[in-house]
């Protein structure tokens, strides 16, 4: 039994570190492997992660942290029994992929405006809740061209367009990701989705 | 709400030794470490050392070695500091302080225990 | 040993104040300082660690920032509760250490 792929992890810089790797062949991974992980820090504790499979050679481990900051540095050991398959360390701080938002909500009564609002994934005493700035993806249901992203580089979890920058009478959806410059992370997950139909008044046109 | 209860003061005798305890009300004792922290008006605040409760292993500040002894009992929750050879240097307040295992910040304090050390 | 230096042993201040009080390393403790807070019976709680990172259940009016050798602790609107004691502590290189403690009083 051998790694084909080597470990690699993602942290939402919250409490869950995500390893995923590949074997040389197909595997139970929740039974013939195990991820011990344990912070390089004074008096620290190894923990145990159970992998679940995710494909046929593919192994994805979801690792507990109690709290994260920029300093922490973890090592990394994957065994099959007795036997060690491979060793590495893993920071945190410089692999982080945030928690996707959530709540997306299209706000129509606002005349002509469209007002769409989602929930940051963090509480407000992690360090990523002030740093998240959003891409928010429109896309029409009916033509596939009309594909937009707005980027919302503030800090305010909302984005309001115009109700006639998109065309009336049409279902439209919408979502959600973030990232955070100040660790660059990579982007998060997109939300779910959420739809509506947009309608708006004509402006009277006098001729 | 994590809670430290430690032991009543003590009034010892110059040359003996004395043990204190400090009961921690968490579920799983194992997941943090005990550290214990001296106070005097003189040295202030000094860190005396830590255990971890899981696998009793210890750190020690050097200034402490052969003078405090920690250990821990984590059927209930409770750890322990022995001092030994005690002298009026040893006079003092001791706190036991709680972090997660493999933090350096003492996230939760007991009240103190009081040692006066006199013939 | 690292030496941590609170300057000011003592601080007057009135309520509604904005109170910074400073905390100097000897040497580079790479962020890990934290800061407590003592009361006149003598119960400690943790406010800050990290530098930056409010302890749960902590007042949002207390607030931490520095980095290298200097650290400070601001109070942003002085409340009765928050006369006590405060003192920094480092907990880079062992043995972790703390400073002398500044004393907060009211005007």
């Known amino acids: 039994m051998k790694v084909l792929q080597e470990p690699t992890c993602v942290s939402d810089y919250m409490s869950i570190s995500t390893c995923e790797w590949k074997m040389n062949g197909p595997t139970n991974c929740s039974t013939e492997l195990r991820l011990l992980y344990q912070l390089v820090f004074l008096l620290s504790e190894a923990h145990t992660c159970i992998p679940e499979n995710n494909g046929g050679a593919g192994c994805v481990c979801h690792l507990l942290m109690d709290d994260v900051v920029s300093a922490d540095n973890y090592t990394l050991d994957l065994w099959a029994g007795q036997q060690l398959l491979w060793k590495g360390s893993f920071k945190p701080s410089e692999h982080v992929k945030p928690r996707a938002p959530g709540n997306l909500t299209v706000h129509t009564n606002v005349s002509d405006t469209l007002l769409l609002t989602w929930s940051n994934p963090y509480p407000p005493d992690n360090y990523l809740y002030n740093h998240l700035t959003y891409a928010v993806n429109i896309w029409s249901e009916n033509d596939p061209a009309d594909f937009r992203i707005y980027n919302v580089t503030y800090l305010e979890p909302s984005l309001r367009i115009a109700a006639s920058t998109l065309k009336s009478g049409i279902s439209y959806r919408a979502r959600v990701r973030a990232w955070a410059q100040c660790y660059n992370t990579t982007w998060s997950e997109w939300s779910p989705s959420t739809k509506w139909h947009n309608s708006y008044r004509e402006p009277f046109e006098q001729h | 709400q994590v809670q430290l209860q430690q032991s009543g003061a003590e009034l010892v005798k110059p040359g003996a030794s004395v043990k204190m305890s400090c009961k921690a009300s968490?579920?799983?004792?194992?997941?943090?470490?005990m550290h214990w922290v001296k106070q005097t008006p003189g040295q202030g605040l000094e860190w005396i050392g830590g255990?971890?409760?899981?696998?009793?292993?210890?750190s020690y500040n050097q200034k402490f070695k052969g003078k405090a002894t920690l250990t821990a009992d984590k059927s209930s929750n409770t750890a322990y500091m022995q001092l030994s050879s005690l002298t009026s240097e040893d006079s003092a307040v001791y706190y036991c302080?709680?972090?997660?295992?493999?933090?350096?910040?003492?996230?939760?304090w007991g009240q103190g225990t009081l040692v006066t050390v006199s013939a | 040993d690292i030496q941590m230096i609170q300057s000011t042993s003592s601080l007057s201040a009135s309520l509604g104040d904005r109170v910074t009080i400073s905390c100097r390393a000897s040497q580079d403790i790479s962020n890990y300082l934290n800061w407590y807070q003592q009361k006149p019976d003598g119960t400690v709680k943790l406010l800050i660690y990290?530098?930056?990172r409010l302890h749960s259940g902590v007042p949002s009016r207390f607030s931490g920032s520095g980095s290298g050798t200097d650290y400070s602790l601001t109070i942003s609107n002085l409340e009765q509760e928050d006369i006590a004691t405060y003192f920094c502590q480092q907990g880079n290189t062992l043995p972790w250490t703390f400073g002398g403690g500044t004393k907060l009083e009211i005007k």
């Open positions: 302080a709680l972090t997660t295992a493999g933090r350096a910040w003492f996230a939760y």
């Open positions: 968490v579920n799983t004792f194992a997941g943090y470490n």
């Open positions: 990290y530098t930056s």
């Open positions: 255990l971890h409760p899981g696998n009793g292993d210890t």
